[in-house]
């Protein structure tokens, strides 16, 4: 059964069905995903029957015997097995299945086997954090404060306002407040808010592939908590980064270079920060945020170390009462410790039980919040440090990083160049753009201590080879060594082509496989503007008129008539601030009408042709879907 004999409508349904089963989004259905599908669908079937059906589907569907079902094989299953019991059960399972959670993971208290389980502890922690964060926001009075002991949270996120606000607290200025619908909400304006929240979450690097507006509207607990955790974590980690917090250099160890320290993730830096203070207190180090902190002793000493000593003007001393250390009962000791944390204004995220159970997620959040409030680090006067090497990432680098993370690459990319030095993330991105990777050729970690870099270099060579031969990228003068060493210009050249191809692939899928290039996008933009009787047009993605954002705003209004409030815009003789104001509105409005835009307002103002292209391409995708 060739794709050609499937109608467009049926193809859309099949794609949707396939995406429901392919929960990890890698383009293939595995045995486990089939198993999970039947569990999640809650069909009245005994375990052995589920196993039989799954095995049957794998046996008949996996035509090339690679242990997984591709989309083409999936089409054949649907057509070839229409009448059988197995196929009927399979279809029923897909139809019954609600959004399977593919975020993060379950917490320590929940389990793999239960699809809809969620952590009460997380809910309690997040509600208290959000209540505190939004307590003075007039737009949230209708839901704040939420009761942490009820399902308030899952109802509160349903209109999108709280999510938008939390995203802006984590990464300020992500969402233009003017675009949030706040009054007299209707199902349509709620949908817009949820689009805005989800697309903005994606733009700050949240992995939201398997979360839809419906899931949030319905308040599906595991999806809501998964998204909130990502948003909260991004906010907590924002300053745990060397270029934004130079005092972290105090954590440099003997014989270590600044470069080594810069490669550490926020989690690793936090652990190192805690151990730096524990060492100063003459205590044992901790190796994790779970079992090693269960007795609260490390926390006691950490609080004592970071508490203000009264040597800073306007910051009164806080003397930590250490008597609770003598408590025999773990829970009691944890409670006493948290009372001391409260005196620092840092009793957040964990209860005494969370400490004693060693809940890693919530303990990480507790420590991150403590770090943000009381880092207690001093920038060393050591002259050997090359401060020039501390420059932060560029906007473009951050956009690329957020794009990768939003696609769910593993592990998360914290530092663009060092985290790509073994090419593993690049291989995952190739898979996302439908370039097949032979994983047998890839060296996988853990890498040996001796010759480890050689293994990484081999990966990088293969990544460049795939780019040239399979993806047909223009990679003249780029070798594996450039990726391995983190050559900025050459690494960015490859990443840009990956992002461009990803964007064009989405457009081509919507357009039924028709090839797309820059000229086609520009023509579509102008044609759409003309049909909507808009006066603006663009000659290319370098057109200076784009700096006003008016072509983008007009296009949004053409795609969704009446969506743009032109009273908020400056249209003539714009100065830089006015251009930025228009651009902020344009980017948020694009996300609000459903376009997954990663570009930043500054990209429009500066007419960065690469990012401008992605904006128009995403809008074109949105416009074509509407037709």
């Amino acid at each position: 059964m060739a794709r050609g004999s499937v109608s467009d409508e049926e193809m859309m349904e099949l794609r949707e069905a396939f995406a429901k089963v392919d929960t990890d989004g890698n383009g293939y259905i595995s045995f486990n995903e089939l198993n999970d599908l039947f569990k999640a669908a809650c069909l009245p079937l005994p375990g052995y029957r589920v196993r039989e059906i799954t095995e049957n589907l794998m046996a008949t569907g996996d035509l090339d015997q690679d242990g997984r079902i591709s989309f083409d094989e999936f089409i054949k299953i649907f057509h070839g097995l229409k009448s059988t019991d197995v196929a009927k059960t399979f279809r029923k399972a897909i139809n019954k299945k609600e959004g399977i959670c593919a975020i993060g993971g379950t917490s320590e208290q929940s389990s793999v086997g239960t699809q809809h389980s969620y952590s009460e502890e997380e809910k309690y922690a997040f509600v208290n954090w959000i209540n505190k964060a939004l307590e003075n926001d007039p737009d949230c009075r209708h839901v704040i404060p939420m009761n942490p002991n009820t399902n308030d949270l899952f109802n509160a996120v349903g209109d999108g306002i709280v999510l938008c606000k939390m995203i802006n607290l984590s990464v300020p200025d992500t969402i233009d407040e003017r675009t949030i619908n706040k009054k007299k909400l209707t199902p349509f304006t709620i949908q817009e808010n949820l689009n805005l929240a989800l697309n903005s979450a994606s733009a700050i690097g949240c992995h939201v592939v398997n979360i839809g507006a419906e899931d949030l509207k319905e308040g599906k607990p595991y999806l809501v908590l998964g998204l909130l955790w990502q948003v909260i974590k991004i906010g907590l980690f924002a300053d745990i980064e060397l270029s934004r917090n130079e005092a972290l250099i105090a954590l440099l160890r003997e014989g270590e270079s600044l470069e080594d320290l810069m490669k550490l993730s926020p989690e690793e830096l936090l652990l190192r920060w805690a151990n730096y203070h524990l060492e100063n207190a003459g205590c044992n180090k901790i190796g994790n945020f779970s079992t090693d902190i269960k007795d609260s002793k490390a926390y006691y000493h950490l609080l004592e170390q970071v508490a203000p000593k009264g040597d800073e003007e306007g910051v009164p001393a806080v003397v930590i009462d250490m008597s609770g250390l003598r408590e025999k009962d773990d829970i009691q000791r944890a409670e006493c410790m948290l009372q001391q944390a409260e005196r620092l204004g840092c009793r957040q995220f964990v209860t005494a039980t969370d400490v004693v159970r060693g809940n890693p997620k919530l303990n990480l959040a507790f420590i991150a919040n403590l770090f943000n409030r009381y880092p207690a680090l001093h920038k060393p006067e050591n002259q050997d440090i090359d401060w020039g090497a501390l420059e932060g990432e560029t906007r473009e680098e951050r956009t690329f990083r957020n794009w990768m993370n939003s696609l769910g690459v593993n592990p998360r990319v914290n530092h663009l160049y060092s985290d790509l030095s073994d090419a593993l993330v690049i291989f995952q991105l190739y898979e996302k753009i439908k370039v097949p990777v032979d994983w047998n050729r890839v060296n996988k970690p853990p890498y040996p201590k001796l010759g480890g870099n050689m293994k990484k270099l081999e990966n990088c060579n293969y990544a460049v080879e795939l780019g040239k031969n399979q993806a047909k990228f223009s990679l003249v003068g780029i070798g594996g060594q450039d990726l391995n060493e983190g050559n900025r210009t050459l690494t960015l050249a490859l990443i840009w082509q990956l992002m461009r191809r990803y964007t064009l692939n989405i457009l081509e899928e919507i357009g039924g496989g028709q090839k797309v290039n820059d000229d086609i996008i520009v023509n579509w933009v102008n044609e759409t503007l003309r049909e909507a009787k808009k006066s603006s047009s663009i000659s290319s993605f370098k057109d200076p008129k784009i700096s006003t954002s008016l072509p983008v705003l007009d296009l949004i209004d053409a795609i969704q008539p009446g969506s743009i409030n032109y009273d908020l815009l400056k249209t003539e003789n714009l100065n830089d601030d006015e251009k930025l104001n228009n651009a902020k509105y344009a980017i948020s409005m694009a996300r609000k009408i459903g376009a997954r835009v990663y570009a930043l307002p500054e990209d429009l103002v500066e007419v960065n042709p690469k990012m401008v292209m992605t904006v128009f391409a995403c809008l074109m995708g949105k416009g074509m879907k509407r037709v």
């Epitope: 595995s30 486990n32 993971g105 793999v112 592990p411 996988k444 970690p445 853990p446 001796l450």
Partner: nanobody
Framework: QVQLQESGGGLVQAGSSLRLSCAVS????????VGWFRRAPGKEREFVAA????????YYADSVKGRFTISRDNNKHTVDLRMNSLKPEDSAVYFC?????????????????WGQGTQVTVSS
């Protein structure tokens, strides 16, 4: 050559505890997820627990939830599985394995490197 080495197995009475440890020799765990699996005689390999590279996201099989705790120490490059309230049905050879992508932590087929295993026997 990188090798995973499990330790801590043994023969214990039902209701007691054990702590298994997985160490990497010749390399460092770095940013890889680590899972524990077990195989009882005549049975299929079964997922037990897993932890992502940072130790923050943990996963458990229903059968061990609340009794077993997985944690990792990235300074020592070890991943521990603390097993409490052991039952005779927990008897098996326990293996640790690494998976850098960690998209499907419960799926043994996704894991890249495996240890030799350590025997756990729980008598009633």
């Amino acid at each position: 050559q990188v090798q995973l080495q499990e330790s801590g197995g043994g023969l214990v009475q039902a209701g007691s505890s054990l702590r298994l440890s997985c160490a990497v020799s010749g390399g460092t765990f770095g940013r890889v997820g680590v899972g524990w699996f077990r195989r009882a005689p005549g049975k299929e390999r079964e997922f037990v627990a897993a932890v992502n590279w940072s130790g923050i996201d943990t996963y458990y099989a229903d059968s061990v939830k609340g009794r077993f705790t997985i944690s990792r120490d990235n300074n020592k490059h070890t991943v521990d599985l603390r097993m409490n309230s052991l039952k005779p049905e927990d008897s098996a050879v326990y293996f640790c394995a690494t998976d850098f992508r960690f998209n499907a932590p419960m799926n043994g087929a996704e894991y890249d490197y495996w240890g030799q295993g350590t025997q756990v026997t729980v008598s009633s």
